[in-house]
Amino acid sequence: GSASAPTLFPLVSCENSPSDTSSVAVGCLAQDFLPDSITFSWKYKNNSDISSTRGFPSVLRGGKYAATSQVLLPSKDVMQGTDEHVVCKVQHPNGNKEKNVPLPVIAELPPKVSVFVPPRDGFFGNPRKSKLICQATGFSPRQIQVSWLREGKQVGSGVTTDQVQAEAKESGPTTYKVTSTLTIKESDWLGQSMFTCRVDHRGLTFQQNASSMCVPDQDTAIRVFAIPPSFASIFLTKSTKLTCLVTDLTTYDSVTISWTRQNGEAVKTHTNISESHPNATFSAVGEASICEDDWNSGERFTCTVTHTDLPSPLKQTISRPKGVALHRPDVYLLPPAREQLNLRESATITCLVTGFSPADVFVQWMQRGQPLSPEKYVTSAPMPEPQAPGRYFAHSILTVSEEEWNTGETYTCVVAHEALPNRVTERTVDKSTEGEVSADEEGFENLWAT
């Protein structure tokens, strides 16, 4: 091959952790040169020589040669960041070349130390135990020591320290994190022992204390919502259920929810507590079934909530609204529009419920005497009638396939409302029906048993 000068490439370590050793290695690759006669030299940015270099024998590849040279630099010099690069110089009969080889930027960053303490109800087992978690984050280089102290004395057992991990970052210097956990007894924690997470990094010590005395009392933000029974739930389940929703509980073990009657008499209350929410709070529900006649009489029912975070019980009282005028709904069943059927895709049947009061209404669709899956229809929330103050309207839309409709299948819209004589009315439509068919039916008990 013909004689040619080398092409130079910088060689820098991919692993950005030169702090692990006392020196940092960078290199220079010379490629495609001929003849095999090459001399490497290295200089700092200020042109002073670098002595600690190491050359590697040249290699013949495709009729031309390649060779590399490595330089070792003290870590501490690199980490001070005075030089962004060093210079690789090459002498060759066909021309001298030089290349800037960047130095890895090594930031020396201190750790941020945080200790996470268990919640009040976070102790389990016998004896009851939990964990303190110490997290050191954002530090560099990666060498670090984590230890635990109790009342200033080193803790020997119950400590687990994970491996140091690089933190996920898109740019900037590589930083690290480490987690250490200490298993503690509830008796020690509640006894107000002072626990300390000690982190040693680059000759400096960082400490974070944890004690049950130091856990701030959160502002009491517990909220109570008393939810009355809906007509739909009474109609469907044949029970009148009062619901008391309690939210923003810091702990669940000390909550009590009770319903009482107007005369102070207790009502049997069934309490359910949620799993912990993402914001580390709990919610609880206290449900009580009552006699429908007691509810309809207008009697007041009170939900009382007690909790250790509450200086005094929270109470919410509800009763059935008085003086609400009863107006029975008019129900109209509208078959699919001819234009829609011409598209041969789906058929939309609309049940229009108008002029009712109060707003509580229940709509269900049936086919061949069986309730249809609620996924097949959409029922709007009751809305005020524009021309009739105090009255409401709603609509329910059932979608079936065009084929189903054309088979002559019948569809029934069942509407339940407390102002209806039998609490329920229905309308039926099929392909042969021009308008809507009315049927104020009695005896729907069997329907609601399903």
């Epitope: 009590t256 009482t260 008499e265 009502v267 209350t269 069934h270 006699c291």
Partner: antibody
Framework: EVQLLESGGGLVQPGGSLRLSCAAS????????MNWVRQAPGKGLEWVSV???????YYADSVEGRFTISRDNSKNTLYLQMNSLRAEDTAVYYC??????????????WGQGTLVTVSS | QSVLTQPPSASGTPGQRVTISCSGS????????VNWYQQLPGTAPKLLIY???QRPSGVPDRFSGSKSGTSASLAISGLRSEDEADYYC???????????FGGGTKLTVL
């Protein structure tokens, strides 16, 4: 005929365990709250535990953490699992049905009782 | 020590009227219904009065109940020898989340 029939009593050593059963008949068992009430020899009645039709359970302070009430509506049976038994748990144990599904209006149906003796 | 307080014993002659008292607090009798039970020797308790003054079917009208404030009482008129039994008052205690009984009153018909 509405009936409750307890079983499972007997002699047990302190620290031991016992499981009482109460078979119900003649009524819709799953719709009622069910209680266990005990009576130590020569002493008065003491309420032990209740299980609501919805599944909620409550216990007297004297048995909290040691006794567990449960029910199997498909078998019309009420249970009381008693652990870490003490001499003072010696009593006749009755199961009893709540009168009213909504309010605390007493217990209208009682079993004949089963004797639990805790002694070494 | 029972949460509800009853006299340990009471007595009367046949035909007489006898009253048994039961006192409690606002967390039980004060706000909740009082129920009464009769326990004949060697048998299970039987509900005698519920919701302060209601009689289950089959209970003679000689038995009556009343409640005032945090106290209640059971009255038996026209006392009979078969009324000789232990009588217990019972209520729900809202602070304890459970039923509470009185210590029982042993009625002797002389």
């Amino acid at each position: 005929e509405v009936q409750l029939l307890e079983s499972g009593g007997g002699l047990v050593q302190p620290g031991g365990s016992l499981r009482l059963s109460c078979a119900a008949s003649g009524f819709t068992f799953g719709s009622y709250e069910m209680n266990w009430v005990r009576q130590a020899p020569g002493k008065g009645l003491e309420w032990v535990s209740v299980i609501y039709s919805g599944g909620s359970t409550y216990y007297a302070d004297s048995v909290e953490g040691r006794f567990t009430i449960s029910r199997d509506n498909s078998k019309n049976t009420l249970y009381l699992q008693m652990n870490s038994l003490r001499a003072e748990d010696t009593a006749v144990y009755y199961c009893a049905r709540d009168t009213n599904p909504y309010y605390y209006y007493g217990m209208d149906v009682w079993g004949q009782g089963t004797l639990v003796t805790v002694s070494s | 020590q029972s949460v509800l307080t009853q006299p340990p014993s009471a007595s009367g002659t046949p035909g007489q009227r006898v009253t048994i008292s039961c006192s409690g607090s606002s967390s039980n009798i004060g706000n909740n219904a009082v129920n009464w039970y009769q326990q004949l020797p060697g048998t299970a308790p039987k509900l005698l009065i519920y919701r302060n003054n209601q009689r289950p079917s089959g209970v003679p009208d000689r038995f009556s109940g009343s409640k005032s404030g945090t106290s209640a009482s059971l009255a038996i008129s026209g006392l009979r020898s078969e009324d000789e039994a232990d009588y217990y008052c019972q209520s729900y205690d809202s602070s304890l989340n459970g039923q509470v009984f009185g210590g029982g009153t042993k009625l002797t018909v002389l």
